[in-house]
């Protein structure tokens, strides 16, 4: 058993049929010694008396808010949550496996630049009685500070018969060094509590591996005289790290016909312009990627040819 | 060329070669993670690699103030990785074909380090750890880790030379 926060405790249980469970001793936070009784949740049934209460925690029915009273007055509370371990593996019932980039990916994180700011998100089908708490650091043995905000519900989607809820959190490294080569990864830890079930999820990454620039901005077409060619130009997204002579991007320019089946013409360039042939009813799209490190491409910025 | 005395390197040549290094490093190891090669016996194998750290002067301001600290750090790293890529880690099994980007990567690391430090000048180099794994799985795990680490190192080096070529070239 360990303390998650003040008056909230997590009991770690091996979860299998007829498991013996864990013996837990609760102590009433009071100077009083006599006349103390214990109850669980809203029940008025007295579970025991005395300054301490010993219970055998085996299932969710044994978890909940234990309260010690004296003469009708509440002295203190202890909330017990369960953390299940099945076949040596901690349960992951609360969050959905996003399966990208690999199986057992519950947390996904992205950064728009090298400033040390990043966003993580996760999915669940649970709509109520759900709380999240997020902590982060750079490195684990001698951790350096990363400050995370509160997790918020950022999107709701309907998937078949189910509703899916996306939560996200923003974090900022306290003393980021954008130009340095990271040697210690960022660690992100999410505590999830659904009713009386506790689970924790972690992710470890370098900012460089989660970089995904915003799409190029101000995408424009300039027809070239007496030609089917156009000059496409664009700019670095505002959110990208500066100076651009140091934090450089590379770009992919694509000409795509109306039909998905039509052959796509692609050009790669380090410049912020390119000359392409604009076909009727086609559109021109540009996306960006770090020039020197193959992290994610941005989403496409697009304009119609006509 | 950068010499310990402090003259400028051939920024544009360094820029071109460092960008080529980035491409080769990703050709040699394009994936972000390797699946079932469990990190057994992974005794801090690549923790001794030289990293370009915050105080090494490789940020735009540091380069403007005095690029020598940063160039020395980059040179140190290039020599370190060049030695690793020429070692038994990369010559033993699993077999690399002669068309492997690792061969070109090895040659390009040497080429860039020579651009930074011509013969007759000596910056101190970091001691390379004696790693001679006997099993193919250990060797492969080390290769992946070294190449991942090299990708990060050459990305910073390429940014330095691109910025230098754009703002510090005479």
């Amino acid at each position: 058993i360990w303390e998650l926060k003040k008056d909230v405790y997590v009991v770690e249980l091996d979860w299998y049929p007829d498991a013996p469970g864990e013996m837990v001793v609760l102590t009433c936070d009071t100077p009083e010694e006599d006349g103390i009784t214990w109850t669980l949740d809203q029940s008025s049934e007295v579970l025991g008396s005395g300054k301490t209460l010993t219970i055998q925690v085996k299932e969710f029915g044994d978890a909940g808010q234990y309260t010690c009273h004296k003469g009708g007055e509440v002295l203190s509370h202890s909330l017990l949550l369960l953390h299940k371990k099945e076949d040596g593996i901690w349960s992951t019932d609360i969050l959905k496996d996003q399966k990208e980039p690999k199986n057992k990916t519950f947390l996904r994180c992205e950064a728009k630049n090298y400033s040390g700011r990043f966003t993580c998100w996760w999915l669940t089908t649970i709509s109520t009685d759900l709380t999240f708490s997020v902590k982060s650091s750079r490195g684990s043995s001698d951790p350096q500070g990363v400050t995370c905000g509160a997790a918020t519900l950022s999107a709701e989607r309907v998937r078949g018969d189910n509703k899916e809820y996306e939560y996200s959190v923003e974090c900022q490294e306290d003393s980021a060094c954008p130009a340095a080569e990271e040697s210690l990864p960022i660690e992100v830890m999410v505590d999830a509590v659904h009713k009386l079930k506790y689970e924790n999820y972690t992710s470890s990454f370098f900012i460089r591996d989660i970089i995904k620039p915003d799409p190029p901005k101000n995408l424009q077409l300039k027809p070239l005289k007496n030609s089917r060619q156009v000059e496409v130009s664009w700019e670095y997204p505002d959110t990208w790290s500066t100076p651009h002579s140091y934090f450089s991007l590379t770009f992919c320019v694509q000409v795509q016909g109306k039909s998905k089946r039509e052959k796509k013409d692609r050009v790669f360039t380090d410049k912020t312009s390119a000359t392409v042939i604009c076909r009727k009813n086609a559109s021109i799209s540009v996306r960006a990627q770090d020039r020197y490190y193959s992290s994610s491409w941005s989403e496409w910025a697009s304009v119609p040819c006509s | 060329r950068a010499v310990p005395g402090g003259s400028s390197p051939a920024w544009t040549q360094c820029q071109q070669l460092s960008q080529k290094l980035c491409t080769l490093a990703w050709s040699a190891h394009p994936l972000v993670g390797h699946m079932d090669l469990r990190e057994e016996g992974d005794e801090e194998t690549t923790n001794d690699v030289p990293h370009i750290q915050c105080g090494d002067g490789c940020d735009p301001q540091g380069l403007r103030d005095n690029s020598q600290f940063c160039l020395q750090r980059i040179h140190q790293g290039l020599i370190f990785y060049e030695k690793l890529l020429g070692s038994d880690i990369f010559t033993g099994e699993p077999s690399l074909l002669p068309d492997s980007p690792v061969g070109q990567l090895h040659a390009s690391l040497l080429g860039l380090s020579q651009l930074l430090q011509p013969e007759g000048h000596h910056w101190e180099t970091q001691q390379i750890p004696s790693l001679s794994p006997s099993q193919p799985w250990q060797r492969l795990l080390l290769r992946f880790k070294i190449l991942r680490s090299l990708q990060a190192f050459v990305a910073v080096a390429a940014r330095v030379f691109a910025h230098g070529a754009a703002t510090l070239s005479p």
Epitope: - | E93, S95, L96, L97, P98, D99, P136, W137, R139, L140
Partner: antibody, heavy 120, light 107 residues
Framework: EVQLLESGGGLVQPGGSLRLSCAAS????????IHWVRQAPGKGLEWIGY????????KYNENFKGRATLSADKSKNTAYLQMNSLRAEDTAVYYC?????????????WGQGTTVTVSS | EIVMTQSPATLSVSPGERATLSCKAS??????VAWYQQKPGQAPRLLLY???TRHTGIPARFSGSGSRTEFTLTISSLQSEDFAVYYC?????????FGGGTKVEIK
């Protein structure tokens, strides 16, 4: 698009010779090794060796050394497998293949194969 | 040379069912193993490399696992187009060698 096209198969007498060709297109011919793999009827795959056209250096499976000769003609973007002293057990479909660019020999591109029958 | 032993030689499975193919190397090959699918009259087609990395365009129902000497190819839900012969291949050591193949047939 990378394409490999084998030719030169056919019926050969035991003890005879044969030269198979593999015409490559869609990539820089000198950049990658070209491998030869064969498959006897109803049997598995057997690696014969490779040629690296950049420096014409071959590497052979010891089981084929002395009987197989690998070469390449850079001007024609074509690799060759010369097989001598053929026996009935050399009857097989012969494939050329090229591996991934990372320098490890998993084979991404294969030719359609050319059939060699050794029989009197 | 490294001997790659595949089992079973033939696997009879109904469409929609799961197929598990095994491949054992006679010595450590790390994860330098590829899997190929071959249909009659066609060249082999690459499915996986590094024991578990799917090649471009290969459906997610194909997955691989294992390291050093024991490897598995799993087809989670067999489609009609998956009935074929499957070969494992080690590219760790010269000469590169292939397993004898597992024929996956309709039950």
């Amino acid at each position: 698009e990378v394409q490999l096209l084998e030719s030169g198969g056919g019926l050969v007498q035991p003890g005879g010779s044969l030269r198979l060709s593999c015409a490559a297109s869609g990539y820089t011919f000198t950049d990658q090794t070209i491998h030869w793999v064969r498959q006897a009827p109803g049997k598995g795959l057997e690696w014969i060796g490779y040629i690296y056209p950049r420096d014409d250096s071959p590497k052979y499976n010891e089981n084929f050394k002395g009987r197989a000769t690998l070469s390449a003609d850079k001007s024609k973007n074509t690799a060759y497998l010369q097989m001598n002293s053929l026996r009935a057990e050399d009857t097989a479909v012969y494939y050329c293949a090229i591996p991934d660019r990372s320098g490890y020999a998993w084979f991404i591109y294969w030719g359609q194969g050319t059939t060699v029958t050794v029989s009197s | 040379e490294i001997v790659m032993t595949q089992s079973p030689a033939t696997l009879s499975v109904s469409p929609g069912e799961r197929a598990t193919l095994s491949c054992k190397a006679s010595r450590d090959v790390a994860i330098a193993v590829a899997w190929y699918q071959q249909k009659p009259g066609q060249a082999p087609r690459l499915l996986l490399y590094w024991a578990s990395t799917r090649h471009t365009g290969i459906p997610a129902r194909f997955s691989g696992s294992g390291s050093r000497t024991e490897f598995t190819l799993t087809i989670s839900s067999l489609q009609s187009e998956d009935f074929a012969v499957y070969y494992c291949h080690q590219y760790s050591s010269y000469p590169f060698t292939f397993g004898g193949g597992t024929k996956v047939e309709i039950k």
